[in-house]
Interface confidence: low
């Protein structure tokens, strides 16, 4: 005869584990008893259950209510048992000892693996700012048994580093994603991908990158200097910049207060019909939590009666 079992039985936490033990005997042979034991390293065998051909199943007190025979129909040569609701502490070596007549005693051993699926968590790093060097963008941690695999899925260029902490019955894996922040990364997804044999499919957690920056400021509206003449209506200056967080705009006049009738509307400075008093140096001040920028322009309102041409100077400073 021969004893058939599996080297490894794998179940997910909370599932029932079938521990197989089948005696493939020659004709006329019978299974008298099957003893299942948990074999702990250096501690010997702790009996789970005895299956007697005459007396049925006897479960040891430590496993009362947790060990059952598989549902009918049952083969008299089948010594398999079900271990209900597997927990992490059940992981280990199990021994099936079959007493057969007339062949004698047979033993087989299997390993029960209880997979504990991870519950991953993603933690963003410190605020990302353009101009920083290599900076932590996010870390992703997943703990399970066996150790999960943690990787990153993103179009963003960066480097990863992983470390593992072994606990008594599980392992926690933390992977960090580092990058050199740039404004092009804004709004880009950074996805932590956790793989584990106890998961039907990979678990994914996505973090949207936010990189603080502030672009240089510039002022539009003076491109056609001939338009800035006395009496012109609808003249305006527009301050151009971009940033994260979105910047706020402020207009001032360097050589005095803003003339009456000039409207400030965020990034736009609107003029009433132009007069010579609108001539002057205007400053656009752009700021966000990250930085601030200035851009100044000189407005020279021309009198069409005068022969002299319009002179416009644009100066940017930051």
């Amino acid at each position: 005869g021969e004893l058939e079992t599996s080297d490894v039985v794998t179940v997910v936490l909370g599932q029932d584990a079938k521990l197989p033990c089948f005696y493939r005997g020659d004709s006329g042979e019978q299974v008298g008893q099957v003893a299942w034991a948990r074999v702990d390293a250096g501690e010997g065998a702790q009996e789970l259950a005895l299956l007697h051909s005459k007396y049925g199943l006897h479960v040891s007190p430590a496993y009362e209510g947790r060990v059952e025979q598989p549902p009918p129909p049952r083969n008299p040569l089948d010594g398999s048992v079900l271990l209900r609701n597997a927990v992490q502490a059940d992981e280990g070596e199990y021994e099936c000892r079959v007493s057969t007549f007339p062949a004698g005693s047979f033993q087989a051993r299997l390993r029960l693996r209880v997979l504990v699926p991870p519950l991953p968590s993603l933690n963003p790093g410190p605020a990302l700012e353009e101009g920083q060097g290599l900076t932590l963008a996010a870390s992703c941690t997943a703990e399970g048994s066996p150790a999960p695999s943690v990787t990153w899925d993103t179009e963003v260029k960066g480097t990863t580093s992983s470390r593992s902490f072994k606990h008594s019955r599980s392992a926690a894996v933390t992977s960090e994603f580092h990058l050199v922040p740039s404004r092009s990364m804004n709004g880009q997804p950074l996805t932590c991908v956790v793989s584990h044999p106890g998961l039907l499919q990979d678990q994914r957690i996505t973090h949207i990158l936010h990189v603080s920056f502030l672009a240089e400021a510039s002022v539009r509206g003076l491109e056609d200097q001939n338009l800035w003449h006395i009496g012109r209506e609808g003249a305006m200056l527009k301050c151009l910049s971009e940033g994260q967080p979105p910047p706020s705009y402020n207009w001032t006049r360097l050589d005095g207060p803003l003339p009456s009738g000039v409207r400030v509307d965020g990034d736009t400075l609107g003029f009433p019909p132009l007069t010579t008093e609108h001539s002057g140096i205007y400053v656009c001040h752009v700021s966000n939590e990250f930085s601030s920028r200035d851009s100044q322009v000189t407005v020279d309102v021309l009198d069409p009666q005068e022969d002299s041409g319009k002179q416009v100077d644009l100066v940017s400073a930051s």
């Epitope: 021969e2 004893l3 008298g32 008893q33 003893a35 034991a37 074999v39 702990d40 390293a41 250096g42 501690e43 010997g44 065998a45 702790q46 009996e47 005895l50 007697h52 006897h58 040891s60 070596e93 021994e95 000892r97 007493s99 062949a103 004698g104 005693s105 047979f106 033993q107 087989a108 051993r109």
Partner: antibody, heavy 120, light 110 residues
């Protein structure tokens, strides 16, 4: 430290009974199969009987079946071999042995042995 | 019953390699397990387990002892032999009941 100490040996007449004991210490007695192995003078080793951890199953070699009974007492951490209808060929040193904790019926610890002489 | 055959004696020199053989009358393997175990016995003492399941060294046994084999043919090797190794060596099978031992091989000095 695992210790197995046999007792109860001696000189006995053929057909008479004798009971051997084995006191176990230093390990979880109720987790292990236990066995008796004997060795006739100047001869090799011969497995005699074994018993499951619970004591619910016993195994014997054919030559002692029906005459010898192996048993165990969990409370006393003791193994016994009741030998009835002794024969001269049962003369041997009897060792109490523990089955190893892994797959395969091997004996990882042995007592010092006790001599049983069957003679008229 | 499975019969295990060992040569009665082996003459060796200290520091040399000794190879003790054990031949089974039928296969003593189940699946990938080879169920042969080796014991050492010195005069007046109980046997001591050296190797189990053909090649697994018992804790505390020196690495100069090693075992190998499969199916029906198995060997115990001692390399190098030391004076303390002079003893009788037994193989045992647990493929089926009754568990049987070889008759033993006496390791003797040349």
């Amino acid at each position: 430290e695992v210790q197995l100490v046999e007792s109860g040996g001696g000189l006995v007449q053929p057909g008479r009974p004798l009971k051997l004991s084995c006191a176990a210490s230093g390990f979880s007695f109720s987790h292990y199969d236990m066995a008796w192995v004997r060795q006739a003078p100047t001869k090799g080793l011969e497995w005699v009987a074994a018993i499951s951890p619970s004591g619910g199953s016993t195994y014997y070699r054919d030559s002692v079946k029906g005459r010898f009974t192996v048993s165990r007492d969990k409370a006393k951490n003791s193994l016994y071999l009741q030998m009835d209808s002794l024969r001269s060929e049962d003369t041997a040193t009897y060792y109490c042995a523990r089955q190893g904790p892994s797959y395969g019926y091997y004996f990882d610890y042995w007592g010092q042995g006790v001599m049983v002489t069957v003679s008229s | 019953d499975i019969v295990l055959t060992q040569s009665p004696a082996l003459d060796v020199s200290l520091g040399q390699r000794a190879t003790i053989s054990c031949s089974a009358s039928q296969s003593v393997s189940i699946s990938r397990y080879n169920l042969i175990h080796w014991y050492q016995q010195k005069p007046g003492q109980q046997p001591k387990l050296l190797i189990w399941r053909t090649s697994i060294l018992t804790s505390g046994i020196p690495a100069r002892f090693s075992g190998r084999g499969s199916g029906t043919d198995f060997t115990l090797t001692i390399n190098p032999v030391q004076a303390d190794d002079i003893a009788t060596y037994y193989c045992q099978q647990s493929r089926e009941s009754p568990f049987t031992f070889g008759a033993g091989t006496r390791l003797e000095l040349k």
